[in-house]
């Protein structure tokens, strides 16, 4: 501790001539203390006569220093080495807005020489988020940005942020970005954005987590393009038709709204109607042929297929056998004595 | 299709005050950070303020800090520059852009601050 | 605030030269760099974000990469229309450009 009532140490010690000031090999650093562990400050001087610590302006009394001595080979000078401890207690005593802080002096023969001063400040995280960060709810490939501001701290937090109790690595995954003042931006939400976010402050004494921020990625919906118009509900004359569409152009996801608007449209259809063909009477019979045949036709045309209507079912023409009239037989009826006279039928005739 | 139009620029007084608008379309400004930014003639960008409605979020460059306001009207899809006690070096184009990223820039509004 | 300096401040090239442009920021800031082109009287547009990603619609032969705290735009093989003063952007801390670098014609 610090020599309140000691023996006072003297501003400079003898030692023989032309040895150069001091230089340190080894200055104090700056050093926290956590929790009730003391801090040790090092020190080491070539070359070195005496050496000691000051905290706050004053001498270290001796028996609070660990000197250790050594010999330079290749000058044979004096190095000297010294460590003290600095208690939480010590700290907490000092009274004022500075810092406390401690230096080392090294003695040769030549004068003093003075290290960096070192600061010793009692480390804490406190409990409680300055701001953390707010669940969210964004349409698919907006922005996102959360908060957070950790709680303070010596020394300051650092900040990570967690997705799904994973550390966010914004060199692995560029759609994250991380700032200065510990916010996280989402670039383009996706729906694998969709998760438990977390801040973590870490500092040398403690780890906080914020509460968990759940961020929802929704998808409204949108429609499908319009089916095709259905047929009319009246095969002829007036109806209806249909078409629909369906809100699957994305469906809605993630609590994402509906599609706005009719699934169904309906509109008035008129269609013509469908004439069937009818057939004209049978025209007259024709004279007898000299094929002793005689003929007669009709047409689809009593009316004539209309709009989609059926055409007539049966025949245009119609023939049968008649005798009035010259009728030559063939030649090899005439000469064939064995041959039979054939009866008559509907489409043969015998000359 | 995403467009952001500013306006509202024009030739002021030192000491006197200017509203900038930039109407935002293609997209819902409410879920995107928007930022203003600036450049003097013959000089390059400078970031001037930003915001994002959804996190009631703003932050300002230290060079207008005090003296710039940011806005947005998320049911005009607009947002805006109120830029008081204005300096001859506020003069510039300023720039509005989308996102963190600055993907969309509108083309541009000059403000000119001179006596 | 973050400084990012941006060299070289102008440089002349031909078309098909492979052109390379660097920032140094002042101090960390992770991989939050962006890359902007701007022609003389228009906006700027971007080119890269997060240090090495291309937006999408920009060609391939814009590239961009990290090294700690420097920062670098490659064009492979130089075309008319990229002929223009490039900016480099901060997003870690409150944004900060580059002061530029004119591309110019040969």
């Known amino acids: 501790g610090i020599d309140s009532g000691g023996q006072a140490l003297p501003d400079s010690f003898p030692s023989a001539p032309a040895e150069q000031l001091p230089h340190f090999l080894l200055e104090p650093e700056d050093a926290y203390i956590v929790k009730n562990k003391p801090v040790e400050l090092h020190c080491r001087a070539f070359p070195a006569t005496q050496i000691y610590f000051k905290c706050n302006g004053e001498w270290v009394s001796q028996k609070g220093h660990v000197t250790q001595e050594s010999l330079d080979e290749a000058t044979g000078l004096r190095i000297r080495e010294v460590q003290i401890e600095v208690s939480r207690q010590q700290v907490e005593e000092l009274f004022g807005l500075e810092d406390y802080w401690c230096q080392c002096v090294a003695w040769s023969s030549s004068g003093t020489t003075k290290s960096r001063r070192a600061y010793i400040r009692i480390a804490y995280l406190r409990k409680n988020f300055d701001q953390e960060p707010l669940a969210k709810e964004v349409p698919l490939d907006h922005e996102v940005l959360l908060q957070c501001r950790p709680p303070e701290g010596v020394p300051v937090a650092e900040v990570e942020w967690l997705k799904n109790e994973d550390v966010i690595d914004p060199a692995q995954d560029t759609n994250f970005l991380l700032t200065i003042d510990h916010n996280l931006i989402i670039r383009q939400a996706r729906l694998s954005d969709t998760a438990n976010y977390t801040c973590v402050a870490k500092n040398i004494v403690a780890k906080r987590r914020s509460t968990t921020a759940t961020v929802i990625v929704y998808v409204n919906g949108g429609w499908s393009s319009w089916a095709e118009w259905s047929p009319c509900s009246n095969r002829c004359g007036r109806g209806w038709q249909k078409r629909t569409r369906t809100c699957t152009n994305p469906a809605p996801l993630n609590g994402g709204a509906f599609c706005e608007g009719q699934a169904c449209q309906k509109t008035a259809c008129t269609t013509v109607c469908p004439v069937d063909g009818a057939w004209t009477e049978w025209s007259k019979w024709s004279a007898c042929s000299t094929e002793c045949a005689h003929w007669r036709s009709r047409e689809c045309m009593a009316p004539p297929p209309q709009n989609g209507g059926r055409d007539c079912s049966g025949t245009l023409l119609d023939s049968k056998n008649c005798t009035d009239g010259l009728c030559v037989l063939n030649q090899r009826t005439l000469n064939d004595p064995k041959s039979r006279p054939l009866e008559p039928s509907g489409d043969v005739a015998l000359y | 299709e995403v467009q952001l139009v500013e306006s509202g620029g024009g030739l002021v007084q030192p000491g006197g005050s200017l509203r900038l608008s930039c109407a935002a379309s293609?997209?819902?400004?409410?879920?995107?950070?928007m930022h203003w930014v600036r450049q003097a003639p013959g000089k390059g960008l400078e970031w001037v303020a930003s915001?994002?409605?959804?996190?009631?979020?703003?932050s300002y460059a230290d060079s207008v800090k005090g003296r710039f306001t940011i806005s947005a009207d998320t049911s005009k899809n607009t947002a805006y520059l109120q830029m008081n006690s204005l300096r001859a070096e506020d003069t510039a184009v300023y720039y509005c852009a989308r996102s963190y990223a600055m993907d969309y820039w509108g083309q541009g509004t000059l403000v000119t601050v001179s006596s | 605030d973050i400084q990012m300096t941006q060299s070289p401040s102008s440089l002349s090239a031909s078309v098909g030269d492979r052109v390379t442009i660097t920032c140094r920021a002042s101090q960390s800031v992770s991989s939050a760099v962006a890359w902007y082109q701007q022609k003389p009287g228009k906006a700027p547009k971007l080119l890269i974000y997060?240090?090495?990603s291309l937006y999408s619609g920009v060609p391939s032969r814009f590239s961009g990469s990290r090294s700690g705290t420097d920062f670098t735009l490659t064009i492979s093989s130089l075309q008319p229309e990229d002929f223009a003063t490039y900016y480099c952007?901060?997003?870690?801390?409150?944004?900060?450009f580059g002061q530029g670098t004119k591309v110019e014609i040969k």
């Open positions: 952007q901060q997003s870690y801390g409150p944004f900060t």
């Open positions: 293609g997209f819902n400004l409410y879920y995107y950070s």
């Open positions: 915001i994002y409605s959804y996190s009631s979020y703003t």
């Open positions: 997060s240090a090495s």
